[in-house]
């Protein structure tokens, strides 16, 4: 593997690790092969501190981040124990809500207007922030 | 100046493999990803497959997935394509191209001359 | 996958005309847009990125504009140089597709 000492040009870098914040939209999927192919994965939040960092220069615009549930309970990307981790929850989030209209549930989570995590349909468009750490060797990704 | 060099192109039967590089210079090559793309004769571009820069996460068209394998060595600034399985709809020049820094997206900026592909036999 | 529409697929012009190439996608793919110059035996050259952004080196008669799905490649005044094939390329998604392609030739 090889090893980053400093943040790539247009990352920032916050607490030893390296955040890209996209201008655009994708998909979950989508915003999730970008994150690996910069050799990283899509945001894992552990803490209030980290979640303020984010939502700081996210802004009060849909996000996506590394949690999931597609198969069956919610995980993050990098394989952070959901169970016992830090959450931010909506209140009523997650709800798997069918009513969209677009066929499933909501099992892609994402930050909303005002910080706080929604479960919603993966394939919305929405931004999303990619994050790795300094000082570790580059691991191959967990499947999903 | 930045430069890529592909070679390893050549004749080869249908079913068999081939092993293409692309040199690359004028740059850090271990800060970027890197791509192939083909073009038929007389046709157009088709994308093949890209790598991140470490190497470890790769992508590819549906078209070559399970037959092509992209790596790298960052060592000797090189990045491969393995050709196996090789089919007449294979046969192309095989272009590496430079994964651009652009702000989300899989651009390429940077391209060789490529190397061409003859499926026949 | 994202299919490009590239059109017009050949198209004759005279030295000083302004061309036009257009090329529209399948789905909204925000300003992820190459243009490309290819000569006959050459790889191709960027010469657009970013939908409207001009490559460093790139004369400034070639001008890139559009967002979304519908995209336009413009030359002001052709040169005999320009003779060659336009490509344009979405990158926002995998797999990266390109339009068909714009051959350009001189009347």
């Known amino acids: 593997g090889s090893e980053r000492t400093c943040c790539p040009v247009n990352w920032v870098e916050h607490e030893r690790s390296c955040y890209w914040f996209s201008r655009s939209g994708k998909a979950w999927a989508d915003a999730d092969n970008y994150c690996r192919l910069e050799d990283a994965h899509l945001v894992v939040v552990t803490s209030w501190e980290e979640q303020k960092f984010v939502q700081h220069h996210i802004g009060p615009v849909n996000t996506w981040m590394g949690l999931h549930d597609q198969n069956g309970p919610w995980k993050w990307v990098d394989g952070t124990d959901y169970e016992t981790g830090f959450k931010n929850w909506r209140p009523e989030q997650p709800d798997d809500w069918y009513g969209h209209g677009l066929g499933g549930g909501e099992d892609c989570a994402h930050f909303t207007d005002d910080g706080r995590w929604n479960d919603d349909v993966c394939q919305r468009p929405y931004r999303w922030v990619c994050e790795t750490e300094l000082d570790k060797a580059s691991q191959e990704p967990p499947l999903l | 100046q930045v430069q890529l060099v592909e070679s390893g192109g050549g004749v080869v039967q249908p079913g068999r493999s081939l092993r293409l590089s692309c040199a690359a210079s004028g740059f850090t090559f271990s800060n970027y990803g890197m791509h192939w793309v083909r073009q038929a004769p007389g046709k157009g571009l088709e994308w093949v497959a890209v790598i991140s820069y470490s190497g470890n996460n790769k992508y590819y068209a549906d078209s070559v997935k399970g037959r092509f394998t992209i790596s790298r060595d960052n060592s000797k600034n090189t990045l491969y394509l393995q050709l196996n399985s090789l089919r007449a709809e294979d046969m192309a020049v095989y272009y590496c191209a430079r994964r651009s820094s652009s702000w989300g997206g899989y651009g390429m900026d940077v391209w060789g001359h490529g190397t061409t592909v003859t499926v026949s036999s | 996958d994202i299919q490009m529409t590239q059109s017009p697929s050949s198209l004759s012009a005279s030295v000083g005309d302004r061309v036009t190439i257009t090329c529209q996608a399948s789905q909204d793919i925000s300003d992820y847009l190459n243009w490309y110059q290819q000569k006959p035996g050459k790889a191709p050259k960027l010469l657009i990125y970013?939908?409207?952004t001009l490559e460093t080196g790139v004369p400034s008669r070639f001008s890139g504009s559009g967002s979304g799905t519908d995209f336009t490649f413009t030359i002001s005044s052709l040169q005999p140089e320009d003779i060659a094939t336009y490509f344009c390329q979405q990158y926002d998604n995998l797999p990266i597709t390109f339009g068909q392609g714009t051959r350009l030739e001189i009347k």
């Open positions: 970013d939908a409207s």
